[in-house]
Interface confidence: medium
């Protein structure tokens, strides 16, 4: 495996972009149980109604690999576990993706990505520790191509859930 | 990490009114959803109001009509107007913000350490 993006690799703060840049995705640094900060996107407005909140990584490289896969762990709320919220209320979000020669990209435009999946939370998860807290993580992993252009971007599209981005990995597999 | 600190409680007659504050330390919360609930005696905590970041309100249908949740960002506080106060409104308010932090079950959710009211007819 050949990994092109690591979220929890990077040094300081992730800085993909967000859209809105208020009120929707925020990153959220986390200690882990050796004090070490892991990067995090969180969303949660599960009360109110309509969300298109939209989070996008930086420019990937694909380094002429035709089918990438993407590993996503996160946790996702259950709905029911949630006090006094309404109909609102999701627990998937969506996954997409954008090919592009340019890696300076400035902005989402939303009619540009192509969607991948829906991204639900399994029942099966691992549990990790940070600190004062057990972490559930889920972990589902989508792979696309064929790609042909010289890189992609990577979108998260959230609808109305309580999620926290924990990792985000993107690799290919040598041949 | 949040913290939220309720204040303005206190003994009030019936048909009186109070306003509880409850204010934020750490980091601001001007992105979530913000709530009161209440716990009387030998009862489960249940929902009074919340308000979202976008200003949408929900009440239970017992306070519908007399009390009003608000909030100011920029002093990291949501309030609650109480009027015209019924004996039944005697409980220990919390305040209540939803973060999307992980964890399991409780360990989303920050809690105030309450203030009572006590309502005498």
């Known amino acids: 495996e050949v990994t092109l993006l690591d979220s929890r690799s990077v040094q300081g703060e992730l800085g993909w972009i967000a859209s809105p840049l208020e009120g929707g995705w925020e990153e959220v640094s986390i200690m882990d149980e050796k004090n070490t900060p892991i990067r995090t996107y969180q969303v949660c407005n599960v009360m109110e109604p309509s969300q298109n909140n939209w989070l996008r990584t930086d420019w990937i490289t694909r380094e002429g690999a035709q089918r990438v896969y993407i590993e996503i762990k996160f946790t996702l709320r259950d709905c029911n576990s949630l006090p006094g919220v309404m109909g609102t209320c999701k627990e998937t979000f969506n996954l997409y993706y954008y090919e592009s020669d340019n890696d300076k990209e400035r902005f989402i435009r939303e009619n540009q990505f192509v969607k991948i999946d829906t991204i639900a939370a399994d029942e099966s998860f691992t549990q990790v520790d940070i600190g004062d807290r057990i972490m559930k993580l889920n972990t589902e992993i989508r792979d696309v191509g064929p790609l042909s252009k010289k890189g992609f971007y990577l979108a998260f599209q959230d609808v109305g859930a309580c999620i926290a981005l924990v990792s985000v990995r993107v690799f290919y597999k040598k041949a | 990490q949040v913290q939220l600190q309720e204040s303005g409680g206190g003994p009030v007659r019936a048909g009186e009114s109070l306003r509880l504050s409850c204010t934020a330390s750490g980091r601001a919360f001007s992105t979530y959803t913000m709530g009161w609930f209440r716990q009387a005696p030998g009862k489960e905590r249940e929902l009074v109001a919340v308000i979202t970041p976008g200003g949408n309100t929900n009440y239970a249908d017992s306070v519908k009509g007399r009390f009003t949740i608000s909030r100011d960002d920029a002093k990291n506080t949501v309030y609650l107007q109480m009027n015209s106060l019924k004996p039944v409104d005697t409980a220990v308010y919390y305040c209540?913000?939803?973060?999307?932090?992980?964890?399991?079950?409780?360990?989303?959710?920050?809690w105030g350490q309450g203030t009572q009211v006590t309502v005498s007819s």
């Open positions: 209540h913000v939803v973060l999307a932090v992980v964890g399991t079950g409780n360990e989303y959710d920050v």
